[in-house]
Amino acid sequence: SSPCPQAWGPPGVQYGQPGRSVKLCCPGVTAGDPVSWFRDGEPKLLQGPDSGLGHELVLAQADSTDEGTYICQTLDGALGGTVTLQLGYPPARPVVSCQAADYENFSCTWSPSQISGLPTRYLTSYRKKTVLGADSQRRSPSTGPWPCPQDPLGAARCVVHGAEFWSQYRINVTEVNPLGASTRLLDVSLQSILRPDPPQGLRVESVPGYPRRLRASWTYPASWPCQPHFLLKFRLQYRPAQHPAWSTVEPAGLEEVITDAVAGLPHAVRVSARDFLDAGTWSTWSPEAWGTPSTGTIPKEIPAWGQLHTQPEVEPQVDSPAPPRPSLQPHPRLLDHRDSVEQVAVLA
């Protein structure tokens, strides 16, 4: 059997670090057998069998000129083997970040913090952190570690399915190359990394006969569980074309009637989502949707006020108790001052 331990990586390749002493091992001889060493394609003897180093070649202070293929020969001239030297660096701890688009699963991505120049792989696992008592921590089979399955095709991402929203997890991403391994441990809680996908299906429609109204509606993101235990709240922004500043409201449900649109101007509308108990952060904004308030006169039959879902004039209370599951049903409300002004304008 070969006296040379096979490092992780392609067969026949041995590894070293620039600026350090490197030992090459002749694979086809018995440990300690004296051999001669040559560079492939060069007749010059690098190290003879009388060096006292047996089957090893020592290169002091290796640099890039030392990379390449080496040949070792036994005393009788037989080929002991060929070795390719590749120089690089031990792994550095990778940089890891985790994110969750729903409250049941999360994914972690990583990047090397330093390029090693050597073949590299990543080992990914996680454990659930269980703390008992004030400062004691227990490890049990139910807490892992478990593998964090990596995406196929070499994407630097792994996914934890069936996570518990209230638990803490410790992610382990270990970078491995032939010169060693280096581990990044990252503590994550689903609550802090939760960032829903943006709401979908945003539509903006005029309200016939009301030149200062626009009705916006949207749906939960498809990635949010179908029968959620945790609801989303929403933030809606709108602005007239060419206007730099957004107006912001927090709708109570899955639609909002804007009552202070600028008559005759197209308006951009976008919406964002967040866990209704303020876990994590707001989603990115949805793609903008556009709508222009109606310019026509009031219809013969004015819709019942209960069918117009508008916001109260007061600012919504961010800290108010969470509403029940958002419904598409509008909230009946009385005609307010802006409505009457708008009606006068329409009827004048």
Epitope: A92, R93, V95, V96, S97, T109, W110, S111, P112, S113, Q114, I115, G117, A156, R184, L186
Partner: antibody, heavy 118, light 107 residues
Framework: EVQLLESGGGLVQPGGSLRLSCAAS????????MTWVRQAPGKGLEWVSS????????QYADSVKGRFTISRDNSKNTLYLQMNSLRAEDTAVYYC???????????WGRGTLVTVSS | DIQMTQSPSSLSASVGDRVTITCQAS??????LNWYQQKPGKAPKLLIY???NLQTGVPSRFSGSGSGTDFTFTISSLQPEDIATYYC?????????FGPGTKVDIK
């Protein structure tokens, strides 16, 4: 010669923007994480932001999150810091620093002074 | 974020004296700690990495020790050129933090 050279500092009004650059030479820039560290006049060192070799991961101090953006152009061996919505407390000498790894700095530039004042 | 504290904040010592600076982390940082020297008007310079390893080219009178939360930096025989501020810095977390610094001058 292995070195880092910052540029782009200067006087800017509160709310203004500035873009710092750091030109690297003498090492394989694309192999290393890079970082911006700042030092307010008479004060200590404060980590600002770091970026991995590929640019795929970035990290920011809470004090600059949402206002500053770190980026790199490996083909130009250059690191950048785009600073928006500048405040008086951002006044500092900004240093560019090289890995090894993440959060360890074995090579520093000479720094560029950013003054935010009206 | 991990907080770093250093003591003393400043010290005066005679040439040839042994100088010791301590650094404490608010949580366990293993040995992910560096020491930097900054001379007036200059950029910082890495002296000690991974708590106890001397950076290439740095004189052997500088040394570091410790692990976990408590670390020590030592100048075995203070020289005039060692007048500077010394900072410890943790990189266990992905958001590195520096200690407030220790200013060293000659009596």
């Amino acid at each position: 010669e292995v070195q880092l050279l910052e540029s782009g500092g200067g006087l800017v009004q509160p709310g203004g923007s500035l873009r710092l650059s750091c030109a690297a030479s003498g090492f394989t820039f694309s192999w290393y994480s890079m970082t911006w560290v700042r030092q307010a006049p008479g004060k200590g060192l404060e980590w600002v932001s770091s970026i991995v070799p590929s640019g795929g991961h970035t990290q920011y101090a809470d004090s600059v999150k949402g206002r500053f953006t770190i980026s790199r152009d490996n083909s130009k061996n250059t690191l950048y810091l785009q600073m928006n919505s500048l405040r008086a407390e951002d006044t500092a000498v900004y240093y560019c620093a090289k890995g090894p790894g993440w959060g360890s700095f074995d090579l520093w530039g000479r720094g560029t002074l950013v003054t935010v004042s009206s | 974020d991990i907080q770093m504290t250093q003591s003393p904040s400043s010290l005066s010592a005679s040439v040839g004296d042994r100088v010791t600076i301590t650094c404490q982390a608010s949580q366990d940082i293993n040995n992910y700690l560096n020491w930097y020297q900054q001379k007036p008007g200059k950029a910082p310079k890495l002296l000690i990495y991974d708590a106890s390893n001397l950076q290439t080219g740095v004189p052997s009178r500088f040394s570091g020790s410790g692990s976990g939360t408590d670390f020590t930096f030592t100048i075995s025989s203070l020289q005039p050129e060692d007048i500077a501020t010394y900072y410890c810095s943790q990189f266990e977390s992905q958001s590195p933090t520096f200690g407030p610094g220790t200013k060293v001058d000659i009596k």
